[in-house]
């Protein structure tokens, strides 16, 4: 018996795909170079987590050409093992790489309010289920609130807690209609917020702040216009806030004149020309008054020299 033995070069992958970490939404390119016996029919194909990607090569998602696999619009479901398969009719070799897709965290799946009896002390406990970290550790959780009565669709941060925490007790302001949500944050940014909580209302209280930027200046020779920066609604501590405005000529020890107004200004008429006045503006609501206000010096209107 005569046998004819032909020895062929083994198929070798000379440069296989490299494991990589990519951001969600980006694209990744795997490359594969192989050497084949020139007398054999070469083939390079790609597999992803065990399934053949060849027939998907013309889709929007995958592009395969000249030993390259391009995956577009990466999502977390794309992560896994990708193999370059170099083959001939005689042999098959495979080189594998791991793709990790990273990005901002997933949504916080669940949010629960507890210790509702603490609302009388303007506190509540918020607990949540951890969010998916998407391969980058959660650094912190941001707790936000919305008041649908006063500022619908506007979310304000109440503070952030470390990423290993899944509950916190919040100090709340009086008379706010709180709806909460929690958002996980990692180095890639914030994720989608949690579903919103039930709405809770804290009890009313006297104001804890007074207006700032109090000024007094005349716009006529015999008046003084007192203005201030009104309290933000979250500092009203009640459904409404008003302002107790007091004034008296500087240096007199007599009683203060005052008016209660709701607009953030008051025109004091019948003043002497360019006289300094002591001014105080205090926040007032249905539960009481703000702290004792500081005194500001304002001036009534000026006149031309005689």
């Amino acid at each position: 018996i005569m046998a004819n033995l032909k020895v062929k070069d083994a198929t070798q992958i000379t440069q296989g795909p490299r494991s990589t970490i990519e951001k969600k939404g980006s694209r990744v390119t795997f490359t594969c170079q192989a050497s084949f016996d020139p007398s054999l029919q070469p083939s390079i194909t790609w597999r992803g987590d065990g399934r053949d990607l060849q027939e998907l090569g013309d889709s929007d998602k995958y592009f395969i050409e000249d030993g390259r696999l391009v995956i577009h619009s990466l999502d977390y479901s794309d992560q896994g093992n990708y193999s370059c398969v170099a083959s001939t009719e005689l042999d098959v070799v495979e080189s594998r790489a791991q793709l990790l897709v990273v990005g901002s965290p997933g949504p916080v799946p669940r949010l629960v309010l507890s210790d509702l009896h603490l609302l009388t002390q303007s506190q509540v406990r918020v607990s949540w289920s951890p969010a998916e970290d998407h391969n980058a550790p959660i650094e912190k959780y941001d707790i936000e609130f919305e008041d649908k009565e006063m500022a619908p669709e506007k979310w304000y941060s109440l503070g952030k807690v470390p990423g290993n925490q899944t509950s916190t007790t919040l100090k709340l302001s009086p008379y706010v209609h709180y709806t909460f949500r929690v958002t996980a944050i990692n180095k890639y940014g914030p994720g989608e917020p949690s579903p919103v909580s039930e709405t809770v209302v804290t009890p009313e209280a006297a104001p804890e702040k007074n207006p700032v930027d109090v000024k007094g200046e005349g716009n006529e020779t015999t008046n003084m216009v007192i203005t201030w920066k009104p309290l933000r609604w979250m500092d009203w501590n009640a459904p409404q806030v008003q302002y107790r405005v007091q004034w008296r000529p500087q240096g007199t020890r007599g009683p203060w004149q005052e008016q209660i107004v709701s607009d953030p200004f008051l025109v004091v008429s019948n003043t002497s020309t360019f006289v300094p006045y002591e001014i105080k503006v205090q926040a007032v609501n249905s539960q009481g008054k703000g702290p004792e206000p500081q005194v500001t010096i304002g001036y009534s209107g000026e006149d031309y020299p005689q």
């Epitope: 107790r244 203060w256 004149q257 107004v261 007032v284 249905s286 008054k289």
Partner: antibody
Framework: QVQLQESGPGLVKPSQTLSLTCTVT?????????WNWIRQFPGKGLEWMGY???????SYNPSLKSRVTISRDTSKNQFSLKLSSVTAADTAVYYC????????????WGQGTLVTVSS | DIQMTQSPSSLSASVGDRVTITCKAS??????VAWYQQKPGKAPKLLIY???YRYTGVPSRFSGSGSGTDFTFTISSLQPEDFATYYC?????????FGGGTKVEIK
């Protein structure tokens, strides 16, 4: 329980000064709130005249111009109203009242005293 | 000064009726309106403040609503002791001013 009681002459001559006092029991007028004078004309209309606050500051109705003065005697827990240059149009039932909170309406009232301006 | 115009000036109703009184402010007063009840020979009694908040001890049949310039006071089911005169008052800014009153009489 907070109680307010007006006192003063029921008859005042035109051009003279009307003087009334409100005695407060059950609460110190220096602790908080505004302490008001309100009058009700024979036609039943109500008019706020002014107040003195717990701290001694005051606020008057500009419609009474400079005719009105409200003062207090903290040692007696009283506050007083003076209305000068009265005319028959000042004939009314005069009430003293304490505010609810610092504003927001009047929560406690005296029973009222009728003052007639007539010669 | 802010004028408060109340209507009607008087109305006749029976026990159990729903009674509505309106008050219109000459300018926007937000929700800074109070309502009072006055019986003959007595001082007014505070019922409602800040347009819709019942004062302590006031029965739930009394309610208020409105904001801006238009306000409503309602007695849901008139009781014998509710026949009286009712006044609105703005507490938006001094000088505080009252409406002219609505006398609720027995039909």
């Amino acid at each position: 329980q907070v109680q307010l009681q007006e006192s003063g002459p029921g008859l005042v001559k035109p051009s003279q000064t009307l003087s009334l006092t409100c005695t407060v029991t059950g609460y110190s007028i220096t602790s908080d709130y505004t302490w008001n004078w309100i009058r009700q004309f024979p036609g039943k209309g109500l008019e706020w005249m002014g107040y003195i606050s717990y701290s001694g500051s005051y606020s008057y109705n500009p419609s009474l111009k400079s005719r009105v003065t409200i003062s207090r005697d903290t040692s007696k827990n009283q506050f007083s109203l003076k209305l000068s240059s009265v005319t028959a149009a000042d004939t009314a039932v005069y009430y003293c009242a304490r505010s609810f909170s610092y504003s927001y309406g009047f929560a406690y009232w005296g029973q009222g005293t009728l003052v007639t301006v007539s010669s | 000064d802010i004028q408060m115009t109340q209507s009607p000036s008087s109305l006749s109703a029976s026990v159990g009726d729903r009674v509505t009184i309106t008050c219109k402010a000459s300018q926007d007063v937000s929700s800074a309106v109070a309502w009072y009840q006055q019986k003959p020979g007595k001082a007014p009694k505070l019922l409602i403040y800040s347009a819709s908040y019942r004062y302590t001890g006031v029965p739930s049949r009394f309610s208020g609503s409105g904001s801006g310039t238009d306000f409503t006071f309602t007695i849901s089911s008139l009781q014998p002791e509710d026949f009286a005169t009712y006044y609105c008052q703005q507490h938006y800014s001094t000088p505080w001013t009252f409406g002219g009153g609505t006398k609720v009489e027995i039909k």
